[in-house]
Interface confidence: low
């Protein structure tokens, strides 16, 4: 058993048939030492008298809180939860598998730049009684400040007959250094409690693997006389860091018919500009990428060639 | 070339060389499959590599004060990942083509010390680590290890010369 | 769901080669880090060798200089060749995916294998 | 080459029943590097355990894998009908990668 914060704690289970479970003790936060009571939740049922109350606690009717009064009058809180292990593995109930880029990725993370900032999201099919909280730090041995804010509900989709619900969270690391090569990866952890049930999650990564830029901005067409080309120019996203001569962005543009069967066309530059034929009803696409390190691309911009 | 009393180096020629190695060592070593995170239980792990830190001043605003510092790490590391790929876990079994992307990684980086640190001009290296694996096998997962470093590292000193050729070239 | 699908069974003389080829259909496949383990009739598996990214190719030394394990990636079809056969080559001859592993927080071929062709029979016999 | 021996070559069981098999190496095999595998007669091998201990996707949680540096056990802790096969322990730790012998486990 552990202190997840104040008066919450979490018990450790190996969750099998007829498993033992594990047998807590519980201390009554007063002074006082007589006349004291033990109930669970909100049944008035007396499960013990006197300063401790010892449980064996097996399965989820054990959990939830348990109250010491006197005569009455509430004495102290001891909420537990339970965390389930089956067959040496920490359950995944909670999180949604989002199976990319690997299966059991419950967390995905994302930067647009390379100040330190970052996002995860993460996805479940539960809608009520779910609380979430992240931890995050440079490094775990000896751990660098990194602060997340709260994480909150970012979306919802209907997939099938189920609801799917996304949750997201920005964090920052605290004395980022745009310009140096990670040594050490961010780790990320969260804790989701639903009900009384308790699991967390992890992951890890350097900055520099999960940047994605914006995509292009200002995307534009300038016919060129008597052809059929035309010049495409686009501007660095404002969310890139800068200066734009340190940090630099390839592009990748791509003229693409109508129909997806269409052969695409495709030119990379280090320039924010490219020549290209457009074609009758085809759109002129262009992604960035990290100039240097290839992680993943943008989404694409796009404007129609007409 | 960053000769004796610190002159700057031939800026351009550094980016284009820079930016070669880097496309070298993604096509040495692309992504394959997906990145994953680390499964607990990997016990080599081999951090030992010279790292370019927040302190050596390769920011713009660093390199603008004094290119020099940065420029002599990025030196180290250079030297360093080019006796690593000259060493047996890169010549060993199991043997690379000689026209391997690795090989060419290699050339490449003795290109770009040379260009940093003419000949009779010696700024201190840092010390190769006696990492030899006996195996084949193990061999294999180091040279995994020593690449993805090495993609960071390249990456680095690309945008510091790319960052030199465009603000501090004469 | 990829699936490893080789060539049908071979009988050969004494002496003479025998390919075998690993085909991956229904998904992504990369030759690279395709094993090859045989098996003889009533008997155990041996690992033979392997096409490994960063390390060209390697074999076991029973089967250094006899066997040849090459790839096309444009067919995602990997290759095993085996020549001068002799009697005891009579074998199930199986391809295997590694199963992925990390090192350092990257992918590596961990050399245990979580995805098998169907097998294939080669009989040496005069 | 690392030699791989199992124990015991056969193992006779009823089903419902805990079967333990063992696998002991010539030299020191680190437990990243030690796989199980599970065979039935005409078909392919199957990954049980990898990393000595962790279950590979879709393998039932009664198979378990347990052990380090020489001695390895693969448990079962109630047999199936569809248990009754020969199961392989295999290490990559060092080239060639080796297997065991094998385990035939039979029904009773």
């Known amino acids: 058993i552990w202190e997840l914060k104040k008066d919450v704690y979490v018990v450790e289970l190996d969750w099998y048939p007829d498993a033992p479970g594990e047998m807590v003790v519980l201390t009554c936060d007063t002074p006082e030492e007589d006349g004291i009571t033990w109930t669970l939740d909100q049944s008035s049922e007396v499960l013990g008298s006197g300063k401790t109350l010892t449980i064996q606690v097996k399965e989820f009717g054990d959990a939830g809180q348990y109250t010491c009064h006197k005569g009455g009058e509430v004495l102290s809180h001891s909420l537990l939860l339970l965390h389930k292990k089956e067959d040496g593995i920490w359950s995944t109930d909670i999180l949604k598998d989002q199976k990319e880029p690997k299966n059991k990725t419950f967390l995905r993370c994302e930067a647009k730049n390379y100040s330190g900032r970052f996002t995860c999201w993460w996805l479940t099919t539960i809608s009520t009684d779910l609380t979430f909280s992240v931890k995050s730090s440079r490094g775990s041995s000896d751990p660098q400040g990194v602060t997340c804010g709260a994480a909150t509900l970012s979306a919802e989709r209907v997939r099938g007959d189920n609801k799917e619900y996304e949750y997201s969270v920005e964090c920052q690391e605290d004395s980022a250094c745009p310009a140096a090569e990670e040594s050490l990866p961010i780790e990320v952890m969260v804790d989701a409690v639903h009900k009384l049930k308790y699991e967390n999650y992890t992951s890890s990564f350097f900055i520099r693997d999960i940047i994605k830029p914006d995509p292009p901005k200002n995307l534009q067409l300038k016919p060129l006389k008597n052809s059929r080309q035309v010049e495409v120019s686009w501007e660095y996203p404002d969310t890139w860091s800068t200066p734009h001569s340190y940090f630099s962005l390839t592009f990748c543009v791509q003229v693409q018919g109508k129909s997806k069967r269409e052969k695409k066309d495709r030119v990379f530059t280090d320039k924010t500009s490219a020549t290209v034929i457009c074609r009758k009803n085809a759109s002129i696409s262009v992604r960035a990428q990290d100039r240097y390190y290839s992680s993943s691309w943008s989404e694409w911009a796009s404007v129609p060639c007409s | 070339r960053a000769v004796p009393g610190g002159s700057s180096p031939a800026w351009t020629q550094c980016q284009q060389l820079s930016q070669k190695l880097c496309t070298l060592a993604w096509s040495a070593h692309p992504l394959v499959g997906h990145m994953d995170l680390r499964e607990e239980g990997d016990e080599e792990t081999t951090n030992d590599v010279p790292h370019i830190q927040c302190g050596d001043g390769c920011d713009p605003q660093g390199l603008r004060d004094n290119s020099q510092f940065c420029l002599q790490r990025i030196h180290q590391g250079l030297i360093f990942y080019e006796k690593l790929l000259g060493s047996d876990i890169f010549t060993g079994e199991p043997s690379l083509l000689p026209d391997s992307p690795v090989a060419q990684l290699h050339a490449s980086l003795l290109g770009l010390s040379q260009l940093l640190q003419p000949e009779g001009h010696h700024w201190e290296t840092q010390q190769i680590p006696s990492l030899s694996p006996s195996q084949p096998w193990q061999r294999l997962l180091l040279r995994f290890k020593i690449l993805r470093s090495l993609q960071a590292f390249v990456a680095v000193a690309a945008r510091v010369f790319a960052h030199g050729a465009a603000t501090l070239s004469p | 769901q990829v699936q490893l699908v080789q060539s049908g069974a071979e009988v050969k003389k004494p002496g003479s080669s025998v390919k075998v080829s690993c085909k991956a259909s229904g998904g992504t496949f990369s030759s690279n880090y395709i094993s090859w383990v045989r098996q003889a009739p009533g008997q155990g598996l041996e690992w033979m060798g392997i096409n490994a990214h960063l390390g060209g190719t390697w074999y076991a030394q029973k089967f250094q200089g006899r066997v040849t394990i090459t790839a096309d990636e444009s067919t995602s079809t990997a290759y095993m060749e085996l020549s001068s056969l002799r009697s005891e080559d009579t074998a199930v001859y199986y391809c295997?995916?590694?199963?992925?592993?990390?090192?350092?927080?990257?992918?590596?071929?961990?050399?245990?294998?979580?995805?098998w062709g169907q097998g294939t029979l080669v009989t040496v016999s005069s | 080459d690392i030699v791989l021996t199992q124990s015991p070559a056969t193992l006779s069981l009823s089903p419902g029943e805990r079967a333990t098999l063992s696998c002991r190496a010539s030299q020191s095999v680190s437990s990243n590097y030690l796989a199980w595998y599970q065979q039935k007669p005409g078909q392919a091998p199957r990954l049980l355990i990898y990393?000595?201990?962790r279950r590979a996707t879709g393998v039932p949680a009664r198979f378990s894998g347990s052990g380090s540096g020489t001695d390895f056990t693969l448990t079962i802790s109630s047999l199936e009908p569809e248990d009754f096969a020969t199961y392989y322990c295999?290490?990559?730790?060092?080239?060639?990668?080796?297997f065991g012998q094998g385990t035939k486990v039979e029904i009773k």
């Open positions: 295997a995916r590694s199963k992925k592993g990390m090192y350092g927080g990257w992918t590596y071929p961990l050399m245990m294998f979580d995805l």
């Open positions: 990393y000595a201990s």
């Open positions: 295999q290490q990559t730790s060092n080239t060639p990668f080796t």
